[in-house]
């Protein structure tokens, strides 16, 4: 039987029952926030091989082992994650043991365990059998495994059972439990999983199978299911469902959903069954089971139920993400804010087509009108009174409408109105009127050429660069010494740079008046020898990075009330130099035979430049022959045992503490203090358990029905 | 915890129709896909008719296509179950049940589950 679409039990142990005929959970297995201790023995799901998702534990009371729950859980196949996990078993207050003993495949994700007081059998695991990668688990706060001295099956009696492998430099017996050992396939398997009896299973079979190389005898499949039989791609006509089993095209039009986009049905993409249309998709028609690629964003149409919606804030903005057609009126109000022009751009930057007005009023946070960097079309079809659809009235800030050489902007019906902007050129408004077609539909008063732009140097020359230069992260540059008609009138210079991987950036990119700009800003001084051209050195740079660099004169705006002309320069692109990458990231070699080793890593994080080759050096190194920490058949070897309370912190310290040596001489001393890297390691430790239970939490805690 | 309780059950006569109804209550009614699914005395439970959240697409057994309606009011959470010309096969009890997220043709084993109501179509 398969049960889904995820299951979560919570609050009442009974629950469990629905797990009773399930073989594989089609989605996740929640068990969560029991609170009253009760008897699980009862409880045992043997049924249960497979769940595609994770499996999540969180605040069971109680519950002591999963092994007589889920005695047969073989894989877990992470299809989809909680938080980049497989497997989380959080704050389970009585767990002892996991007990999963016939686990052996979690096929993507990692592992979080962590909080659990007294929980033991955790380094009695090999977890690189199970998982791909064991890098990212996380395996905190639990009981300290010398208070649990974890035995496995056999090694009291000096008859141990289980087999070896070794962890972090340690050879020991891998097991779950004091009776269940880790299940291990013979080396002649490889890859393959393996029955009871130690034959190999058929390469298409995961976790492990009832008979030896039967793709019909498979516990779980490595690829997809179809027709009890484990097949490595689905056959025609079939399409993968939920990552795991071969559907038709009748199973996936007859699934119903609960979720509110429903009512068209799932859809067939790229040979997958699937709720919706992956990203840059759109139907093929509405009832269609299909998918075709958008031109350009996706079109998702969104309509203000009063007609007019108000822009005054982030929240309020947040409501249109995503939105490509906006059915309604926009009035923008943006008075302040913080990071506010990134803020926009990113929830109202797909807006294409606006069907009825934009007004702007009152946005002294705003300095342009590129977030709206699609808009396209103000169709006009409600007006304000007057006529106006594009209607811009006491903006203090604003300095620029759109980068006019980069867009198209249509209104098709209705006026433009502009007053009361100080900081807009006359000569940017006129430009609009060109090229959104509205040229001749205004009347004089609707563009007031005396308060707008009013303490603007509207009247721009060009700067031109004289010289560049460049290392690995610095960058020279100079330019014309800019001579205005009173030379009293300029004051300095500003130079704008950023990180520009591709050359379409605009001055007023991610800037508002209320102190963000993604540009960062140097003063240069004028030179006091006329004859010498100001230039700037732009250090601490990234090497092999493309910047974007621009220089702005810095003049008096007004002389008695005479327009006065400014100066900038184009935008510049340069290129720092390259230089040493950084190391290599996740190193890992292994063994697969008895002269051959396999290394295989990632590229660096900072390549700085055009990576053309990698330099790998080896040698050879002693083996390490301290292989036991504990005699647990001595009695003063076998630790105190003292109840853990599940909290992250640092061991007690016994009263003469043998800690690592400072200085020369031998003896007990205090621990090195920390250094700065590892208290900030630390710190985002801390940070990092924070944001998981963070996450944890809102994931599921719901509230209460009414 | 969803608890569903259905109504409607009762004799009547072949070629007769009746509406069942089942009652939601402890969650929100929408985000559920809705069945019902029959057992008739000495056979298995089979599946009868599904239900979307949104109340917009049906699925329905082959043995009950064109007789028989399915329907939901979100806003009184119930589900309907309008049967139409009644056979003597027809008789069993209906139980109404809830899953949560979706519901694949092959899912059986559904989240929540309804008492049930006798149906008897008989002469």
């Known amino acids: 039987e398969i049960c889904g679409p995820g299951i979560d039990i919570r609050n009442d142990y009974q629950q469990l029952k629905r797990l009773e005929n399930c073989t594989v959970i089609e989605g996740y297995l929640h068990i969560l926030l029991i609170s009253k201790a009760e008897d699980y023995r009862s409880y045992r799901f043997p049924k249960l091989t497979v769940i595609t998702e994770y499996l999540l534990l969180f605040r069971v009371a109680g519950l002591e082992s999963l092994g007589d729950l889920f005695p047969n859980l073989t894989v877990i196949r992470g299809w989809k994650l909680f938080y980049n996990y497989a497997l989380v078993i959080f704050e389970m207050t009585n767990l002892k043991d996991i007990g999963l003993y016939n686990l052996r495949n979690i096929t993507r994700g990692a592992i979080r365990i962590e909080k659990n007081a007294d929980l033991c059998y955790l380094s009695t695991v090999d977890w690189s059998l199970i998982l791909d990668a064991v890098s990212n688990n996380y395996i905190v706060g639990n009981k300290p495994p010398k208070e649990c001295g974890d035995l496995c099956p056999g090694t009291m009696e000096e008859k141990p059972m289980c087999e070896k492998t070794t962890i972090n430099n340690e050879y020991n017996y891998r097991c779950w439990t004091t009776n269940r050992c880790q299940k291990m396939c013979p080396s002649t398997c490889g890859k393959r999983a393996c029955t009871e009896n130690n034959e190999c299973c058929h390469p298409e079979c995961l976790g492990s199978c009832s008979a030896p190389d039967n793709d019909t005898a498979c516990v779980a499949c490595r690829h997809y299911y179809y027709a009890g039989v484990c097949v490595p791609a689905c056959p025609p006509n079939t399409y993968r469902f939920e990552g795991w089993r071969c559907v038709d095209r009748d199973f996936c039009a007859n699934i119903l959903s609960a979720e509110s986009s429903d009512s068209e049905g799932f859809v067939i993409h790229d040979g997958e069954c699937m709720q919706e249309c992956p990203s840059g998709f759109i139907r093929n028609g509405s009832q269609s089971m299909y998918c075709i690629p958008c031109e350009g964003p996706c079109p998702k149409v969104c309509e203000e139920e009063k007609k007019t919606k108000t822009i005054d804030s982030v929240t309020s903005a947040q409501m249109l993400q995503g939105c490509t057609i906006f059915k309604g009126n926009l009035l923008i109000n943006i008075r302040r804010g913080n990071n506010i022009a990134s803020e926009l751009e990113n929830f109202m930057g797909l807006i294409e087509v606006v069907t009825g007005y934009v007004k702007i009023r009152h946005s002294h946070a705003l300095v342009s009108l590129s977030f709206l960097k699609n808009l396209r079309l103000i169709l006009g079809e409600e007006q304000l009174e007057g006529n106006y659809s594009f209607y811009v009235l006491d903006n203090q800030n604003l300095q620029q409408l759109w980068d006019w050489d980069h867009r198209n902007l249509t209104i098709k019906a209705g006026k433009m109105y502009f007053a009361f902007n100080p900081k807009l050129c006359v000569s940017e408004i006129y430009r609009m009127e060109e090229v959104t077609g509205t040229k001749g539909r205004q009347s004089k008063g609707d563009i007031n050429t005396r308060n707008n732009g009013e303490r603007a140097s509207c009247e721009s020359d060009v700067l031109h660069f004289t010289s560049t230069t460049t290392s690995k992260n610095r960058i020279i540059i100079t330019w014309h010494r800019y001579r205005p008609p009173d030379y009293r009138d300029l004051i300095s210079f500003t130079v704008y740079y950023k990180e520009a991987p591709f050359k379409n950036v605009t001055e007023y990119d991610g800037q508002d008046a209320c102190g963000s700009n993604s540009w960062n800003m140097v003063d240069v001084d004028l030179p006091p020898n006329k004859d010498v051209e100001p230039g700037i050195l732009l250090h601490g740079l990234k090497p092999w990075t493309q910047y974007a660099v621009y220089v702005k004169a810095v003049t008096l705006t007004m002389v008695e009330n005479d327009h006065i002309r400014g100066a900038k320069s184009e935008i510049l692109y340069i290129r720092t130099n390259a230089s040493v990458p950084s190391i290599p990231l996740d190193v890992l070699s292994a063994s697969n035979s008895s002269s051959q080793l396999i290394v295989k890593w990632n590229p660096p994080s900072l390549p700085n430049g055009n990576l053309s080759y990698y330099i790998v050096r080896w040698q050879r190194q002693p083996q390490d022959g301290y292989l036991y920490r504990h005699n647990y058949c001595s009695k003063d070897k076998i630790p105190i045992r003292k109840y853990a309370d599940g909290t992250i912190d640092i061991e007690e310290v016994t009263e003469n503490p043998k800690t690592e040596v400072c200085g020369g001489e031998k003896g007990p001393c205090c621990a090195c203090p920390k250094t700065e890297a590892e208290k900030q390691a630390e710190k985002e430790e801390a940070e990092y358990r924070k944001v998981f239970e963070n996450f944890l939490h809102n994931s599921i805690f719901v509230p209460r029905p009414e | 915890e969803v608890q569903l309780v259905e109504s409607g059950g009762g004799l009547v006569q072949p070629g007769g129709s009746l509406r069942l109804s089942c009652a939601a209550s402890?969650?929100?009614?929408?985000?559920?896909?809705m069945s019902w699914f029959r057992q008739a005395p000495g056979k298995e439970r089979e599946f009868v008719s599904a239900?979307?959240?949104?109340?917009?697409?049906?699925r329905y057994a082959d043995s009950v296509k064109g007789r028989f309606t399915i329907s939901r009011d979100n806003s009184k959470n119930t589900l309907y179950l309008q049967m139409n010309s009644l056979r003597a096969e027809d008789t069993a009890v209906y139980y109404c049940?809830?899953?949560?997220?979706?519901?694949?043709?092959?899912?059986?084993?559904?989240?929540?589950w309804g008492q049930g109501t006798l149906v008897t179509v008989s002469s």
């Open positions: 402890g969650r929100t009614f929408s985000s559920f896909v």
């Open positions: 049940a809830a899953n949560p997220r979706r519901a694949t043709p092959d899912l059986t084993q559904y989240a929540y």
């Open positions: 239900i979307s959240g949104s109340g917009s697409r049906m």
